[in-house]
């Protein structure tokens, strides 16, 4: 199971496997979670402490019970590892730590004008991991505004300092956000030199590309086939690095294959887990646990709900085997790959899925033809579950916006199909930020279903709402994934800190924008809503919201798309950007579909459709 | 850490009224309804009502409504919970719960209010 | 308002045995639910929901399931720290409903 909750004050006693300064919980979290024997952590923040060796101090552990016992210690946290998690699960940490010096190698020093400057430098750097900033009070005149890119060989920082006027953190590169684009390319019989910063075992080139992309100075690999010529180095993939970041030679080597880091990729990531089952293979490794299952799909899905258990092999030997169930071995190893790797056997192995991001869990719970006037410019990942909806006749359009509930399931406004009801003109666009980023390449969703409201009529603003049933399940990454539905009980609920978003016009008579536009706008009671609306029917299932002195609101675009409002530490999709008279007009509030008053029929249709809920609802 | 600390407690005649406090620390008070919730002695759990303190909206079940207010004070992150016209079947522990999401992640330690002439 | 109905207000187990509490909504709560422990003399705590999943400090062998009106909460293997009261609580529609609870109890 996922366990999310942190400990305040306190400390896990014993397991220990590994040590590392962090400057926050959460980040310590995120190691833990990435390292193979990690189940537990305690970090101790600068407060905590007065060792200053010890302040920062993040701690990694490991227990055979998945617990360990805790001491009150004032000011530690701690917590579980997010294996398991699903899509909470991700290398990305975007904060920015001010006051803290995170110290490393420093290898380029630079003038720049902001912190944000200095994480996009790091970001845009091959070797850099983390960074620190001294901003424009720095007490020493000579150092203000110094960019110090930082590598070290945990990849997390030698020391932490706390220094004023400093700020600090870590590169974007985990979430996809490099300029700097990948090799994808595979090299066969190739060899890559220069400096090797690990070996493991693997059963193939690709498990060994992804070791590679999520360790942290990984910047290439050779790996070694099962025919290479030295017994004792078949199945060796060699983690490699260089001072220029590109290998210094390569030589034609029969079977071996050589190949890149992705964690340069732009938009996406490989998953940090390896899914695909080897047959005829044997992974060898330390024995957790043998289960009598029924087929390797089954031991791989054991593996996986036993939280320790890294690698398996299912085994079809006789003696094995009883009725239809056979012997299925759980592994784990020191660095999480087999010790000793096997061919031509009677078995079949893989690894556990604890680390991939398309579990079912809730990921909701994880963070943020109506253009938005007067908002700001978003950025990726902030609002995951927008989409945009296109449609393509003779040029291809953006006409609305569309949100995100499940992994087959997209929440827009009905009069989006007003005209336009056949499911082949549409293309949805999700895990987007830039328009202009569309090509003819850029992969997109087509409808399988369209669900308008049976209550919906066109050129009314009542009942406007539809679900879009999307040909092919979406897979969820930093960039896509689902927005939490409220409860039906949610329709009295207060929401006081709210947004929209959308590609919509920035002005009444304007044109669609090309990033994703996002405003803060407050709700509007009924009430007033209806006070300003006075030709029309403000109802209980709809939701007002804008500014009394206008300037900021949605506008033609943006319909279709979300409003969404920060509850009890929770993103809801409160309300879908319906109509309005103009845009951000003075005493002209924009009219939301309210979503919970739907709920019922969401949770209906969905269901009725797919025989049990798809909707990342908080369930 | 999230923690909620409510007071003590309370012995009412029948008729009178009950003011229970509830003092939040460790979070953003304004951005989390608190919750009230009660349990008569060797009984189950009841909803009562909530309030939003960064808005001042409140909901109530409509079993208690006209005879309950819950109010909240931002400057002392503290929520109060009234209860009027008390009877005896109103002798309970008096929780006040604040959620993380919808269930309610955090307790107070409970105020025993007993109602007897 | 949604009734919840806990069937059995008490259950005795043997250390070691898999326990298994129930849970009736008087209508379809689409997975809105939320389990509570709570022992003697203290406050309920958060047990699970569909919101969170298990929450930290609870053993492994606590589980979840259901769908629509019914319920379960099931323990693998009763330990002699799981002696409580155990309450489910519906937050699908206002009010929110729990269940009467079911006090766990080792034999």
């Known amino acids: 199971g996922c366990l999310t909750q942190l400990y305040e004050n306190a400390f896990f006693r014993g397991g220990d496997v590994a040590s590392m300064y962090t400057p926050n919980a959460q980040y310590c979290q995120m190691r833990c979670t990435f390292h193979p024997r990690c189940l537990l952590f305690s970090f101790l923040p600068a407060s905590s402490i007065n060792d200053m060796e010890k302040r920062f101090g993040c701690f990694l552990k490991d227990s055979v019970t998945g617990t360990l016992p805790k001491v009150h210690r004032t000011g530690a946290v701690s917590g579980h590892s997010l294996k398991q998690c699903g899509h909470q699960i991700s290398a990305c940490h975007r904060d920015i730590y001010k006051g803290v010096d995170m110290r490393g190698v420093n290898f380029n020093v630079s003038k720049v004008s902001s912190v944000e400057e200095c994480q996009k430098r790091c970001t845009s750097n091959i070797r850099c991991q983390f960074f620190s900033y001294a901003t424009q009070t720095f007490h020493k005149a000579e150092y203000r505004n110094n960019c110090l890119l930082k590598y070290s060989p945990g990849g997390t920082p030698t020391a932490i300092k706390v220094l004023s006027n400093v700020e600090s953190g870590f590169s974007l590169k985990p979430c996809a956000l490099s300029e700097i684009g990948c090799h994808m390319n595979i090299f066969q019989h190739l060899a890559f030199s220069d400096v090797d910063v690990a070996r493991v075992l693997t059963p193939d080139a690709f498990v060994c590309r992804t070791i590679c992309t999520y360790h942290p100075n990984c910047l290439f690999f050779t790996f070694y086939t099962n025919v290479w010529k030295i017994e004792s180095q078949r199945n060796v993939c060699l983690l490699k690095t260089s001072e220029s970041g590109t290998p210094s030679s390569s030589t034609p080597q029969e079977n071996t294959i050589s190949g890149y880091s992705l964690l340069t990729c732009k938009r996406t990531l490989p998953e940090p887990c390896h899914s695909k089952i080897y047959p005829g293979v044997d992974f060898g490794g330390e024995e957790l646990n043998v289960t009598f299952v029924k087929g390797v799909n089954v031991c791989q899905e054991t593996c996986t709900k036993m939280i320790r258990c890294q690698f398996f092999t299912y085994s079809l030997l006789p003696e094995d085997c009883k009725e239809e169930k056979c012997k299925c071995f759980l592994r784990l190893s020191m660095d999480g790959s087999p010790t000793r790797i096997a061919y031509g056997t009677q078995g079949s192995s893989g690894y556990s899925l604890r680390l991939c991001n398309t579990g079912d869990n809730s990921v909701c719970t994880t963070k943020t033809s109506t253009r938005i006037v007067g908002g700001t410019n978003s950025s990726w990942g902030e609002w995951p579950w927008q989409v945009s909806l296109q449609v393509k006749l003779t040029a291809q359009r953006h006409l609305c916006g569309g949100s995100l509930i499940g992994h087959q399931w997209v929440l827009t406004a009905a009069h989006c199909f007003d005209g336009l009801p056949l499911q082949d003109v549409w293309r949805i666009y999700s895990g987007i930020l830039n328009l202009s980023d569309i090509t003819k390449d850029t992969p997109f969703s087509q409808i399988k279903e369209i669900i308008i409201h049976q209550n919906y009529k066109v050129s009314e603003g009542n009942h406007d709402i539809a679900l879009i049933k999307l040909q092919a399940p979406l897979n969820y990454t930093e960039f896509q994934k689902p927005i939490c539905l409220p409860s039906k009980g949610d329709t009295s609920t207060i929401y006081t800190n709210c947004w929209v978003t959308g590609w919509g016009f920035s002005k009444e008579k304007g044109e669609i924008q090309n990033i994703l536009q996002k405003v803060n706008i407050p709700l509007v009671t009924n009430e007033e809503c209806q006070k300003r609306y006075q030709d029309y029917k403000i109802t209980q299932r709809m939701v007002c919201a804008g500014y009394k002195e206008g300037g900021k609101d949605a506008c033609k675009g943006d319909s279709g798309g979300p409003l969404v409002c920060k509850h009890n530490g929770m993103w809801r999709l409160v309300g879908i950007t319906s109509w309005g008279e103009g845009c951000a007009r003075r005493e002209q509030p924009g009219v939301y579909t309210k979503v919970a008053e739907y709920m019922d029929w969401i949770l209906e249709k969905t269901q009725s459709s797919d025989g049990k809920a798809q909707m990342q609802s908080p369930a | 850490q999230v923690q909620l600390v409510q007071s003590g407690s309370e012995l009412k005649k029948p008729g009178a009224s009950v003011k229970v406090s509830c003092k939040a620390s460790g979070y953003t008070f304004t951005d989390y309804e608190m919750h009230w919730v009660r349990q008569p002695p060797g009984k189950g759990l009841e909803w009562i009502g909530a309030?939003?303190?960064?808005?001042?909206?409140?909901a109530y079940n409509q079993k208690f409504k006209g005879r309950v207010t819950i109010t909240a004070d931002e400057s002392t992150s503290t929520a109060y919970m009234e209860l009027s016209s008390l009877r005896s079947e109103d002798t309970a522990v008096y929780y006040c719960?604040?959620?993380?999401?919808?269930?309610?992640?955090?307790w107070g330690q409970g105020t025993l209010v007993t109602v007897s002439s | 308002d949604i009734q919840m109905t806990q069937s059995s207000s008490s259950f005795s187990g043997s250390l070691g045995d898999r326990v298994t509490i129930t849970c009736k909504a008087s209508?379809?709560?689409?997975?809105?639910l939320a389990w509570y422990q709570q022992k003697p003399g203290n406050a309920p705590r958060l047990l699970m929901s569909?919101?969170?999943g298990l929450e930290a400090g609870f053993h492994l062998r606590f589980s979840g399931s259901g769908s629509g009106k019914d319920y379960t909460l099931s323990i693998a293997s009763l330990q002699t720290e799981d002696v409580a009261t155990y309450y489910c609580q519906q937050y699908w529609s206002t009010p929110w409903t729990f269940g009467g609870g079911t006090k766990l109890e080792i034999k």
């Open positions: 719960a604040r959620p993380y999401g919808y269930p309610f992640a955090y």
């Open positions: 309030i939003h303190p960064g808005s001042g909206g409140t």
């Open positions: 209508e379809d709560i689409y997975n809105r």
């Open positions: 569909g919101e969170t």
